[in-house]
Protein backbone atom coordinates (compact mmCIF):
# COMPACT_ATOMS: atom_id res chain seq x y z
CA UNK A 1 0.00 0.00 0.00
CA UNK A 2 1.63 3.23 -1.15
CA UNK A 3 1.05 6.49 0.72
CA UNK A 4 -0.35 9.49 -1.18
CA UNK A 5 3.09 11.07 -1.15
CA UNK A 6 4.70 7.96 -2.65
CA UNK A 7 2.01 7.84 -5.35
CA UNK A 8 2.52 11.52 -6.15
CA UNK A 9 6.27 11.03 -6.42
CA UNK A 10 5.91 7.99 -8.69
CA UNK A 11 3.26 9.66 -10.89
CA UNK A 12 5.35 12.76 -11.46
CA UNK A 13 8.49 10.79 -12.21
CA UNK A 14 6.65 8.52 -14.64
CA UNK A 15 5.11 11.45 -16.49
CA UNK A 16 8.55 13.01 -16.83
CA UNK A 17 10.04 9.79 -18.15
CA UNK A 18 7.58 9.44 -21.04
CA UNK A 19 9.85 11.72 -23.06
CA UNK A 20 12.99 9.70 -23.63
CA UNK A 21 15.21 12.41 -25.06
CA UNK A 22 15.69 16.13 -24.69
CA UNK A 23 18.33 18.61 -25.86
CA UNK A 24 21.28 18.83 -23.50
CA UNK A 25 21.33 21.83 -21.15
CA UNK A 26 24.49 23.83 -21.85
CA UNK A 27 23.99 26.69 -19.41
CA UNK A 28 21.88 27.24 -16.34
CA UNK A 29 18.66 29.21 -16.99
CA UNK A 30 18.27 32.68 -15.51
CA UNK A 31 17.90 32.65 -11.70
CA UNK A 32 19.36 29.12 -11.46
CA UNK A 33 22.77 28.57 -9.87
CA UNK A 34 25.38 26.20 -11.22
CA UNK A 35 26.87 23.65 -8.85
CA UNK A 36 29.27 21.42 -10.76
CA UNK A 37 27.20 19.56 -13.38
CA UNK A 38 23.84 20.70 -12.00
CA UNK A 39 21.70 23.79 -12.09
CA UNK A 40 19.94 24.49 -8.79
CA UNK A 41 16.93 26.72 -8.16
CA UNK A 42 16.44 27.75 -4.55
CA UNK A 43 12.80 28.73 -4.09
CA UNK A 44 11.89 31.96 -2.37
CA UNK A 45 8.35 30.95 -1.48
CA UNK A 46 7.20 28.04 0.68
CA UNK A 47 5.19 24.88 0.02
CA UNK A 48 4.54 21.44 1.47
CA UNK A 49 6.74 18.68 0.05
CA UNK A 50 4.13 17.41 -2.46
CA UNK A 51 3.62 20.87 -3.97
CA UNK A 52 7.37 21.39 -4.10
CA UNK A 53 7.77 18.12 -5.98
CA UNK A 54 5.07 19.20 -8.45
CA UNK A 55 6.59 22.65 -8.86
CA UNK A 56 9.99 21.25 -9.83
CA UNK A 57 8.28 18.92 -12.29
CA UNK A 58 6.56 21.82 -14.05
CA UNK A 59 9.99 23.39 -14.47
CA UNK A 60 11.25 20.23 -16.19
CA UNK A 61 13.42 19.52 -13.19
CA UNK A 62 13.23 17.47 -10.03
CA UNK A 63 13.54 18.05 -6.33
CA UNK A 64 17.21 17.95 -5.41
CA UNK A 65 18.92 14.56 -5.36
CA UNK A 66 22.14 14.44 -3.35
CA UNK A 67 24.70 11.82 -4.34
CA UNK A 68 27.02 11.99 -1.32
CA UNK A 69 28.20 14.01 1.65
CA UNK A 70 30.48 16.11 -0.53
CA UNK A 71 27.57 17.27 -2.70
CA UNK A 72 25.54 17.97 0.43
CA UNK A 73 28.25 20.26 1.79
CA UNK A 74 28.62 22.13 -1.49
CA UNK A 75 24.85 22.62 -1.68
CA UNK A 76 24.70 23.82 1.93
CA UNK A 77 27.41 26.36 1.14
CA UNK A 78 24.98 28.02 -1.27
CA UNK A 79 22.38 28.55 1.49
CA UNK A 80 22.83 32.11 2.72
CA UNK A 81 20.63 32.11 5.81
CA UNK A 82 21.23 29.50 8.49
CA UNK A 83 17.63 29.62 9.68
CA UNK A 84 16.09 28.51 6.37
CA UNK A 85 15.06 24.95 5.51
CA UNK A 86 14.71 23.54 1.98
CA UNK A 87 12.92 20.38 0.86
CA UNK A 88 14.95 17.88 -1.16
CA UNK A 89 13.80 14.80 -3.09
CA UNK A 90 13.89 12.32 -0.23
CA UNK A 91 10.96 11.03 1.81
CA UNK A 92 10.07 8.08 4.02
CA UNK A 93 8.60 5.07 2.25
CA UNK A 94 6.13 3.44 4.62
CA UNK A 95 5.87 0.30 2.51
CA UNK A 96 9.62 -0.25 2.55
CA UNK A 97 10.28 1.39 5.93
CA UNK A 98 13.24 3.29 4.56
CA UNK A 99 14.24 6.69 3.24
CA UNK A 100 13.70 6.74 -0.52
CA UNK A 101 14.89 9.21 -3.14
CA UNK A 102 12.33 10.28 -5.73
CA UNK A 103 14.31 8.41 -8.40
CA UNK A 104 13.47 5.17 -6.59
CA UNK A 105 16.82 4.52 -4.93
CA UNK A 106 17.23 4.14 -1.19
CA UNK A 107 19.35 6.35 1.03
CA UNK A 108 22.79 5.09 1.83
CA UNK A 109 22.83 5.50 5.60
CA UNK A 110 26.34 6.94 5.49
CA UNK A 111 25.44 9.80 3.14
CA UNK A 112 23.25 11.98 5.35
CA UNK A 113 23.04 12.30 9.11
CA UNK A 114 19.33 12.93 9.55
CA UNK A 115 17.99 14.69 12.63
CA UNK A 116 14.51 13.51 13.51
CA UNK A 117 12.33 10.47 13.10
CA UNK A 118 12.02 8.05 10.19
CA UNK A 119 8.26 7.60 10.04
CA UNK A 120 5.17 7.97 7.88
CA UNK A 121 4.65 11.38 6.27
CA UNK A 122 8.23 12.41 6.93
CA UNK A 123 10.24 14.21 4.28
CA UNK A 124 13.79 15.49 4.31
CA UNK A 125 14.92 19.09 4.40
CA UNK A 126 18.36 20.62 4.53
CA UNK A 127 19.65 23.79 6.14
CA UNK A 128 23.02 25.51 6.01
CA UNK A 129 24.35 23.09 8.61
CA UNK A 130 22.04 20.08 9.01
CA UNK A 131 19.63 17.56 7.50
CA UNK A 132 16.19 17.26 9.10
CA UNK A 133 13.18 14.98 9.01
CA UNK A 134 10.04 17.14 8.88
CA UNK A 135 6.34 16.48 8.45
CA UNK A 136 5.78 16.57 4.69
CA UNK A 137 2.88 18.99 5.21
CA UNK A 138 5.23 21.62 6.63
CA UNK A 139 5.48 24.67 4.38
CA UNK A 140 9.13 25.48 3.72
CA UNK A 141 11.27 26.37 0.69
CA UNK A 142 12.65 23.79 -1.72
CA UNK A 143 15.47 23.16 -4.20
CA UNK A 144 14.93 22.06 -7.79
CA UNK A 145 17.71 20.59 -9.93
CA UNK A 146 18.40 20.25 -13.63
CA UNK A 147 21.34 18.27 -14.99
CA UNK A 148 23.86 20.16 -17.11
CA UNK A 149 24.73 18.01 -20.13
CA UNK A 150 26.33 19.28 -23.34
CA UNK A 151 24.92 16.49 -25.53
CA UNK A 152 21.50 15.03 -26.27
CA UNK A 153 20.83 12.63 -23.47
CA UNK A 154 18.42 10.04 -22.27
CA UNK A 155 16.04 11.28 -19.60
CA UNK A 156 16.34 9.06 -16.59
CA UNK A 157 14.29 9.34 -13.40
CA UNK A 158 17.04 11.22 -11.61
CA UNK A 159 17.84 13.69 -14.39
Amino acid sequence: QKSSIEKCSVDIQQSRNKTTERPGLLNCPIYWQQLREKCLLFSHTVNPWNNSLADCSTKESSLLLIRDKDELIHTQNLIRDKAILFWIGLNFSLSEKNWKWINGSFLNSNDLEIRGDAKENSCISISQTSVYSEYCSTEIRWICQKELTPVRNKVYPDS
Partner: antibody, heavy 117, light 110 residues
Framework: QVQLQESGPGLVKPSETLSLTCTVS????????WSWIRQPAGKGLEWIGR???????NYNPSLKSRLTMSLDTSKNQFSLRLSSVTAADTAVYYC???????????WGQGTLVTVSS | QSALTQPPSASGSPGQSVTISCTGT?????????VSWYQQHPGKAPKLMIY???KRPSGVPDRFSGSKSGNTASLTVSGLQAEDEADYYC??????????FGGGTKLTVL
Protein backbone atom coordinates in the same frame (compact mmCIF):
# COMPACT_ATOMS: atom_id res chain seq x y z
CA GLN B 1 11.60 38.74 -26.07
CA VAL B 2 9.11 38.02 -23.28
CA GLN B 3 5.79 39.84 -23.74
CA LEU B 4 2.59 39.83 -21.71
CA GLN B 5 -0.76 41.18 -22.89
CA GLU B 6 -3.81 41.74 -20.69
CA SER B 7 -7.30 41.49 -22.17
CA GLY B 8 -10.84 41.78 -20.85
CA PRO B 9 -13.73 44.19 -20.39
CA GLY B 10 -12.81 47.75 -19.52
CA LEU B 11 -16.10 48.36 -17.73
CA VAL B 12 -17.65 46.19 -15.03
CA LYS B 13 -20.82 46.88 -13.05
CA PRO B 14 -20.73 46.99 -9.23
CA SER B 15 -21.35 43.60 -7.57
CA GLU B 16 -20.40 41.76 -10.78
CA THR B 17 -17.22 39.79 -11.51
CA LEU B 18 -14.15 41.29 -13.12
CA SER B 19 -12.45 38.83 -15.51
CA LEU B 20 -9.07 39.36 -17.17
CA THR B 21 -6.74 37.14 -19.17
CA CYS B 22 -3.01 37.51 -19.71
CA THR B 23 -1.43 36.01 -22.82
CA VAL B 24 2.27 35.27 -22.60
CA SER B 25 4.63 35.10 -25.58
CA UNK B 26 8.37 34.55 -25.72
CA UNK B 27 8.37 32.48 -22.54
CA UNK B 28 6.89 29.14 -21.62
CA UNK B 29 4.24 29.64 -19.01
CA UNK B 30 5.31 26.36 -17.44
CA UNK B 31 8.63 27.43 -15.95
CA UNK B 32 7.59 30.44 -13.89
CA UNK B 33 4.98 31.86 -11.53
CA TRP B 34 2.59 34.53 -12.78
CA SER B 35 1.10 37.42 -10.84
CA TRP B 36 -1.53 40.10 -11.07
CA ILE B 37 -0.87 43.60 -9.72
CA ARG B 38 -3.15 46.63 -9.80
CA GLN B 39 -2.77 50.38 -9.55
CA PRO B 40 -5.64 52.81 -8.88
CA ALA B 41 -5.26 56.11 -10.72
CA GLY B 42 -2.58 58.28 -9.12
CA LYS B 43 -1.85 55.69 -6.45
CA GLY B 44 0.64 52.95 -5.69
CA LEU B 45 0.90 49.32 -6.72
CA GLU B 46 -0.95 46.48 -4.99
CA TRP B 47 -0.07 42.82 -5.44
CA ILE B 48 -3.22 40.78 -6.06
CA GLY B 49 -1.93 37.22 -6.19
CA ARG B 50 0.02 34.61 -8.12
CA UNK B 51 -0.51 31.25 -9.73
CA UNK B 52 2.02 28.44 -10.04
CA UNK B 53 2.02 26.23 -13.10
CA UNK B 54 1.24 23.32 -10.79
CA UNK B 55 -2.10 25.09 -10.32
CA UNK B 56 -1.63 26.22 -6.74
CA UNK B 57 -2.23 29.87 -5.92
CA ASN B 58 -1.22 32.53 -3.39
CA TYR B 59 -3.58 35.44 -2.87
CA ASN B 60 -3.29 38.82 -1.16
CA PRO B 61 -5.05 38.23 2.17
CA SER B 62 -7.15 41.37 1.75
CA LEU B 63 -8.63 40.11 -1.54
CA LYS B 64 -8.56 36.35 -0.98
CA SER B 65 -12.28 35.84 -0.42
CA ARG B 66 -13.12 37.37 -3.83
CA LEU B 67 -10.26 35.99 -5.95
CA THR B 68 -9.90 33.10 -8.35
CA MET B 69 -6.91 32.56 -10.61
CA SER B 70 -6.49 29.90 -13.28
CA LEU B 71 -3.99 28.93 -15.93
CA ASP B 72 -4.13 27.35 -19.38
CA THR B 73 -0.72 26.03 -20.40
CA SER B 74 -1.96 24.98 -23.85
CA LYS B 75 -2.79 28.61 -24.68
CA ASN B 76 0.07 30.10 -22.62
CA GLN B 77 -2.50 32.16 -20.73
CA PHE B 78 -3.47 32.82 -17.13
CA SER B 79 -6.60 34.49 -15.82
CA LEU B 80 -7.98 36.55 -12.96
CA ARG B 81 -11.52 36.66 -11.60
CA LEU B 82 -12.45 39.17 -8.89
CA SER B 83 -16.03 38.89 -7.66
CA SER B 84 -18.38 41.41 -6.00
CA VAL B 85 -16.48 44.41 -7.32
CA THR B 86 -16.98 47.96 -6.10
CA ALA B 87 -15.68 51.34 -7.24
CA ALA B 88 -12.61 50.71 -5.07
CA ASP B 89 -11.57 48.00 -7.53
CA THR B 90 -11.24 50.54 -10.35
CA ALA B 91 -7.59 50.44 -11.41
CA VAL B 92 -5.07 49.61 -14.08
CA TYR B 93 -4.51 45.85 -13.84
CA TYR B 94 -1.12 44.44 -14.77
CA CYS B 95 -0.06 40.86 -15.29
CA UNK B 96 3.58 40.04 -14.62
CA UNK B 97 6.05 37.20 -14.64
CA UNK B 98 6.99 36.33 -11.08
CA UNK B 99 10.01 34.02 -11.48
CA UNK B 100 10.67 33.18 -7.84
CA UNK B 101 7.62 34.54 -6.07
CA UNK B 102 9.34 37.66 -4.78
CA UNK B 103 9.79 40.07 -7.71
CA UNK B 104 8.36 40.80 -11.17
CA UNK B 105 10.73 40.86 -14.12
CA UNK B 106 8.32 41.28 -17.07
CA TRP B 107 5.05 43.20 -17.07
CA GLY B 108 2.11 43.62 -19.39
CA GLN B 109 1.30 47.16 -20.51
CA GLY B 110 -1.73 47.21 -18.21
CA THR B 111 -5.45 47.46 -18.82
CA LEU B 112 -7.78 49.95 -17.19
CA VAL B 113 -10.84 48.43 -15.55
CA THR B 114 -13.55 50.81 -14.39
CA VAL B 115 -16.26 49.68 -11.99
CA SER B 116 -19.36 51.76 -12.64
CA SER B 117 -23.06 51.31 -13.28
CA GLN C 1 -1.99 52.88 3.41
CA SER C 2 0.97 51.06 1.89
CA ALA C 3 2.78 48.35 3.82
CA LEU C 4 6.20 49.90 3.07
CA THR C 5 6.97 53.58 3.63
CA GLN C 6 8.69 55.69 0.97
CA PRO C 7 9.17 59.46 0.82
CA PRO C 8 6.63 60.95 -1.60
CA SER C 9 9.31 62.84 -3.52
CA ALA C 10 13.03 63.14 -4.13
CA SER C 11 15.06 65.33 -6.45
CA GLY C 12 18.53 66.03 -7.72
CA SER C 13 20.41 67.79 -10.49
CA PRO C 14 21.90 65.97 -13.47
CA GLY C 15 25.10 64.17 -12.49
CA GLN C 16 24.22 64.09 -8.79
CA SER C 17 23.29 61.08 -6.68
CA VAL C 18 19.91 60.54 -5.07
CA THR C 19 18.92 57.89 -2.53
CA ILE C 20 15.32 56.76 -1.98
CA SER C 21 14.47 54.92 1.21
CA CYS C 22 11.93 52.17 1.82
CA THR C 23 11.07 51.34 5.41
CA GLY C 24 9.25 48.22 6.50
CA THR C 25 9.33 45.88 9.46
CA UNK C 26 11.10 42.70 10.54
CA UNK C 27 8.22 40.81 8.90
CA UNK C 28 9.06 42.09 5.42
CA UNK C 29 12.13 44.19 4.53
CA UNK C 30 14.06 43.24 7.66
CA UNK C 31 13.16 39.58 7.56
CA UNK C 32 14.16 38.68 3.99
CA UNK C 33 16.74 39.64 1.39
CA UNK C 34 13.94 39.90 -1.14
CA VAL C 35 13.56 43.62 -1.75
CA SER C 36 13.01 44.81 -5.32
CA TRP C 37 12.72 48.24 -6.95
CA TYR C 38 10.66 49.32 -9.96
CA GLN C 39 10.78 52.39 -12.19
CA GLN C 40 7.55 53.67 -13.71
CA HIS C 41 7.29 56.43 -16.26
CA PRO C 42 3.87 58.13 -16.70
CA GLY C 43 1.40 55.93 -18.56
CA LYS C 44 3.83 53.00 -18.70
CA ALA C 45 4.16 49.69 -16.91
CA PRO C 46 6.68 49.39 -14.08
CA LYS C 47 10.16 48.11 -14.95
CA LEU C 48 12.31 45.97 -12.65
CA MET C 49 15.49 47.82 -11.67
CA ILE C 50 16.78 45.87 -8.66
CA TYR C 51 15.90 42.49 -7.15
CA UNK C 52 17.09 40.54 -4.11
CA UNK C 53 18.18 43.85 -2.49
CA UNK C 54 21.10 44.62 -4.79
CA LYS C 55 21.01 42.51 -7.99
CA ARG C 56 20.56 44.32 -11.30
CA PRO C 57 18.77 42.67 -14.23
CA SER C 58 20.62 42.79 -17.54
CA GLY C 59 20.04 46.09 -19.32
CA VAL C 60 19.72 48.17 -16.15
CA PRO C 61 22.56 50.73 -15.93
CA ASP C 62 25.03 50.29 -13.08
CA ARG C 63 24.13 53.81 -11.96
CA PHE C 64 21.26 52.08 -10.12
CA SER C 65 22.21 50.26 -6.94
CA GLY C 66 20.35 48.83 -3.98
CA SER C 67 21.20 48.14 -0.36
CA LYS C 68 19.54 47.26 2.92
CA SER C 69 20.17 47.90 6.59
CA GLY C 70 17.81 46.50 9.19
CA ASN C 71 14.21 47.27 8.22
CA THR C 72 15.14 49.92 5.63
CA ALA C 73 16.10 49.34 2.02
CA SER C 74 17.56 52.02 -0.24
CA LEU C 75 17.80 52.67 -3.96
CA THR C 76 20.64 54.95 -5.07
CA VAL C 77 20.71 56.56 -8.50
CA SER C 78 24.12 58.05 -9.22
CA GLY C 79 25.01 60.29 -12.14
CA LEU C 80 21.38 61.39 -12.49
CA GLN C 81 20.07 61.72 -16.03
CA ALA C 82 16.91 63.34 -17.36
CA GLU C 83 15.42 59.95 -18.27
CA ASP C 84 15.66 58.83 -14.62
CA GLU C 85 12.74 61.13 -13.80
CA ALA C 86 9.94 58.71 -12.90
CA ASP C 87 8.09 57.12 -10.01
CA TYR C 88 10.01 54.47 -8.06
CA TYR C 89 8.38 51.71 -6.04
CA CYS C 90 9.97 49.33 -3.60
CA UNK C 91 8.58 45.88 -2.91
CA UNK C 92 9.35 43.14 -0.43
CA UNK C 93 8.47 39.55 0.22
CA UNK C 94 6.40 39.53 3.39
CA UNK C 95 6.27 35.86 4.33
CA UNK C 96 3.58 33.22 3.75
CA UNK C 97 4.02 33.80 -0.01
CA UNK C 98 2.86 37.42 0.24
CA UNK C 99 4.35 40.50 -1.47
CA UNK C 100 3.94 44.14 -0.42
CA PHE C 101 4.75 47.43 -2.14
CA GLY C 102 5.72 50.89 -1.00
CA GLY C 103 3.62 53.95 -1.79
CA GLY C 104 6.05 55.21 -4.42
CA THR C 105 8.52 58.09 -4.70
CA LYS C 106 8.41 60.70 -7.46
CA LEU C 107 11.97 61.41 -8.56
CA THR C 108 12.48 64.80 -10.20
CA VAL C 109 15.61 65.70 -12.13
CA LEU C 110 16.07 69.43 -11.67
Amino acid sequence: QVQLQESGPGLVKPSETLSLTCTVSGSSISFYYWSWIRQPAGKGLEWIGRIYTSGSTNYNPSLKSRLTMSLDTSKNQFSLRLSSVTAADTAVYYCARDPLGTFFDYWGQGTLVTVSS
Amino acid sequence: QSALTQPPSASGSPGQSVTISCTGTSSDVGGYNYVSWYQQHPGKAPKLMIYEVSKRPSGVPDRFSGSKSGNTASLTVSGLQAEDEADYYCSSYAGINNVVFGGGTKLTVL
